[in-house]
């Protein structure tokens, strides 16, 4: 499956243009912004999604302590450069020739520099901590029910094997989902934890990337789980390189 054959749409990415011009008249979909062909049977890479988002018309719109090397995406949106596989290029630059290095989820991991800045390799983000605060409920959720439902969600909606959901922590009202995926663990065809986390983040914010599907309706044993705050921490296989100035 590359796309829904019947009406030629991309179930996993609504930010695409699809037409039956693939081999044998098959439906083929291309991401907005980059024009790259996407596989609609799986999640589209975050880089292509960010690029598409920047090209689209603008609308008004027992807990883990993150390590000292954890990154938070403070820079927000930018128009990224993606490689031919749809991954982030290690070096990103803006229109004013300001450049910086990013990790595999596109988050800046160095100070900003000029065009002479070198980023030798794309450093993999192997550990993502999704920190959620849910709205008040009658009582706390059952931890094992919550764990099971979130694992099911990541498997069925985001196609992430549960072996990459390292843990689900819960101390009402805080939920933490730990995603882990080393380079050696990730087989061909496995969804990247960075892409799954991005789809989840957009779902939680009510900005679903899925084509023609209802928004995310998260329930634990029938009880709605409504998220009022999300924070995502990214840990790379190699710690980031920031000057001391940034850390003070």
């Amino acid at each position: 499956h590359t796309a829904a054959q019947d009406n030629c749409t991309c179930p996993t990415n609504k930010m695409t243009v699809c037409s039956p011009d693939g081999p044998g008249g098959r439906c083929q979909c291309r991401a907005l912004g980059s024009g790259m062909a996407v596989d609609c049977s799986t999640l589209t890479s975050k880089c292509l999604l960010l690029k598409a988002r920047m090209s689209a018309p603008k609308n008004a719109r027992t807990l883990v302590r993150p390590s000292e090397h954890a990154l938070v995406d403070n820079d927000g949106l930018y128009d990224p450069d993606c490689d031919p596989e749809g991954r982030f290029k290690a070096r990103q630059c803006n229109q004013t020739s300001v450049c910086w290095c990013v990790n595999s989820v596109g988050v800046r991991r160095t100070d900003k520099g000029d065009l002479s800045l070198r980023c030798d390799e794309l450093v993999r983000t192997h550990h993502i901590l999704i920190d959620l605060r849910h709205r008040p409920t009658a009582g706390a959720f059952n931890h094992s029910d919550l764990d099971a439902e979130l694992r099911r969600l990541f498997r069925e909606r985001y196609r992430l094997h549960p072996k990459f959901v390292a843990a689900v922590h819960y101390e009402q009202p805080t939920i933490q989902i730990e995603l882990r995926q080393n380079t050696s663990q990730k087989a061909a065809g496995d969804v990247d934890i960075g892409d799954a986390a991005y789809y989840f983040e957009r779902d939680i914010k009510g900005e679903s990337l899925f084509q023609g599907r209802g928004g995310l309706d998260l329930r634990v044993r029938g009880e709605p789980l409504q998220v009022e705050r999300t924070l995502i921490y990214y840990l790379d296989e190699i710690p980031p390189k920031f000057s001391m100035k940034r850390l003070t």
Partner: antibody, heavy 119, light 111 residues
Framework: QVQLVQSGAEVKKPGASVKVSCKAS????????INWVRQAPGQGLEWMGV????????SYNQKFKGRVTMTTDTSTSTAYMELRSLRSDDTAVYYC????????????WGQGTMVTVSS | EIVLTQSPATLSLSPGERATLSCRVS??????????MHWYQQKPGQAPRLLIY???NLESGIPARFSGSGSGTDFTLTISSLEPEDFAVYYC?????????FGGGTKVEIK
């Protein structure tokens, strides 16, 4: 309560195809993928593949690739498994089984469909 | 593919006795402390029934005399005191890696 009800026994000739159905009830069909497992007489269990009821696409055991097709009909909450080019060693009980919540365990099983391949 | 080896092939015991079934895996099915190993019971003419998931978690509705242990490549299913209805075939299964595979089974029979 969750139930998976399969179609009845089949007798097929070598080279023919068989299509087994698995009707789900008692839960939201598109929330859980469906696996297919077979068991030859007196033998162990063999996983054939899994179909996403949410997306409609399947992942097959390499052993059956090219001969098996798994599909779903969300309007009737039914999963199907078609096996082509049948041989005598395909004689087995075929089970559908639902993924459990968190760890890809199979928490509910159909009652099984006996498929006999004989000339 | 991951190969699961169960032993013994047959276990002859009397009701009330303790049963210990072993499952050895060709490579680790542990991911960050989560073991993708499950146990099923099958009686003649019936579909398998999930007993234990994630190596040691008791499935809802399964009696507490069943327990699972182990991690990585060595796993055990224990039935603390055999009841007449426990005489059946038991299978271990890994869901760490596609293709998912089952052990050859251990038959627990009445002595």
């Amino acid at each position: 309560q969750v139930q998976l009800v399969q179609s009845g026994a089949e007798v097929k000739k070598p080279g023919a195809s068989v299509k087994v159905s698995c009707k789900a009830s008692g839960y939201t069909f598109t929330d859980y993928s469906i696996n297919w497992v077979r068991q030859a007489p007196g033998q162990g269990l063999e996983w054939m593949g899994v179909i996403s009821t949410y997306y409609g696409d399947a992942s097959y055991n390499q052993k059956f690739k090219g001969r098996v097709t798994m599909t779903t009909d969300t309007s009737t909450s039914t999963a199907y498994m078609e096996l082509r080019s049948l041989r005598s060693d395909d004689t087995a009980v075929y089970y559908c089984a639902r993924y459990g919540d968190g760890y890809n365990q199979f928490d509910y099983w159909g009652q099984g469909t006996m498929v006999t391949v004989s000339s | 593919e991951i190969v699961l080896t169960q032993s013994p092939a047959t276990l002859s015991l009397s009701p009330g006795e303790r049963a210990t079934l072993s499952c050895r895996v060709s490579e680790s099915v542990d991911s960050y402390g989560n073991n993708f190993m499950h146990w099923y019971q099958q009686k003649p003419g019936q579909a398998p029934r999930l007993l234990i998931y994630r190596a040691s978690n008791l499935e809802s509705g399964i009696p507490a005399r069943f327990s699972g242990s182990g991690s990585g490549t060595d796993f055990t299913l224990t039935i603390s005191s055999l009841e007449p209805e426990d005489f059946a075939v038991y299978y271990c299964q890994q869901s760490y890696e596609d293709p998912y595979t089952f052990g050859g089974g251990t038959k627990v029979e009445i002595k």
